[in-house]
Amino acid sequence: QSPPGKPEIHKCRSPDKETFTCWWNPGTDGGLPTNYSLTYSKEGEKTTYECPDYKTSGPNSCFFSKQYTSIWKIYIITVNATNQMGSSSSDPLYVDVTYIVEPEPPRNLTLEVKQLKDKKTYLWVKWSPPTITDVKTGWFTMEYEIRLKPEEAEEWEIHFTGHQTQFKVFDLYPGQKYLVQTRCKPDHGYWSRWSQESSVEMPNDFTLKD
């Protein structure tokens, strides 16, 4: 039996700059029941607070609701482990909510097969930003990627679309069913998960790719 090992805050994420969650790895428990608490202070303040919500985001986590989240302040967060033999603390982690945003995937992915005047066919891919994202006001600047592949293929073909919420894909194989997904990333944050797949079958009635 021994004091607990040092815990580690291994991830903090916000879906929208309005709430966020931090998760920790407990470390060894020293063979004894061990209690974990997350404490934090904010830049320029001496007061230390305890995690407002240990439940919402699951085990070994702390959820900060709107009431406790500010993008104007740095959070200095520590996890403390305590058992009968002693205690240990994680290294403090400095969290700027601007830099931990991982949004929901884009919505309303639509696929349309179109034809140019010269009979060249292309796939027009369109989507909407995630619901929670206030892109119009500049609160978020979002970048996007799409990926697509023939249904049976292993490898995805990825296209970065910048800030555009639509993209035209040329030179696809006729008669093939294609799977398409999209994802987004805010200016300083992390890529979202890929959206659910949408599929489309390219028509047969145009010239085959070389």
Partner: antibody, heavy 118, light 112 residues
């Protein structure tokens, strides 16, 4: 505790390339971006670029595009920077540095001195 | 790129005196989120830099309170209220509001 280990020095010939390593320990490697910074002898610091080890997404200082390539090996928790077509201007100390979830550098490697000499 | 101009290049001081280092940016360092990402680092010979102050005025963990930062917009100052022997090192300001992140040229604090 968080540690970033870098080799002390590399001596390389002009026109060749070098791959610098930065082995991370004491934290979850894929959770934090890794930056690279250049310091020429007796001079200031220059930010080269950053890589997100979770998906290898990179962002470079325009000045170093084509010169530096950032990669990671998540299984060994190691970040790499490949420098190509080396000239005397590339002789410098190169640091890897990690922020927290913030945009400053909390942890630094000890730096690798790259000397480009015939 | 944002140019960070530090003055003076070298600052002779007596132990116990106050030292003041200035840093000026070529454009405003106020981020679109309202924060100002101006930081100060200290570097000892043969070592990597260490963070002293983040976001203009916040002392990093373990930094003595004789170090303080101030300023806004494009003009910033690092003050050391009572210089000690261990403070006679190289200081850099740095901005991370705009990509690429940039650094000042450095100020060497030395004994008068």
């Amino acid at each position: 505790q968080v540690q970033l280990q870098q080799p002390g020095a590399e001596l390389v010939r002009p026109g060749t390339s070098v791959k610098l390593s930065c082995k991370a320990s004491g934290y979850t490697f894929t959770s934090f971006w890794m930056h690279w910074v250049k310091q020429r002898p007796g001079q200031g610091l220059e930010w080269i670029g950053v890589i997100d080890p979770s998906d290898s997404h990179t962002n470079y200082n325009q000045k170093f595009k084509g010169k530096a390539t950032l990669t990671v090996n998540t299984s060994s928790s190691t970040a790499y920077m490949h420098l190509s077509s080396l000239t005397s201007e590339d002789s410098a100390v190169y640091y890897c540095a990690r922020g927290d979830y913030s945009n400053w550098f909390t942890y630094w490697g000890q730096g690798t001195l790259v000397t480009v000499s015939a | 790129d944002v140019v960070m101009t530090q003055t003076p290049f070298s600052l002779p001081v007596s132990l116990g005196d106050q030292a003041s280092i200035s840093c000026r940016s070529s454009q405003s360092l106020v981020h679109s989120n309202g924060n100002t990402y101006l930081h100060w680092y200290l570097q000892k010979p043969g070592q990597s830099p260490k963070l002293l102050i983040y976001k203009v005025s916040n002392r990093f963990s373990g930094v003595p309170d004789r170090f303080s930062g101030s300023g806004s917009g494009t003009d910033f100052t690092l003050k050391i209220s009572r210089v000690e022997a261990e403070d006679l090192e190289l200081y850099f300001c740095s901005q991370s509001t705009h990509v690429p992140w940039t650094f000042g040229g450095g100020t060497k604090l030395e004994i008068k």
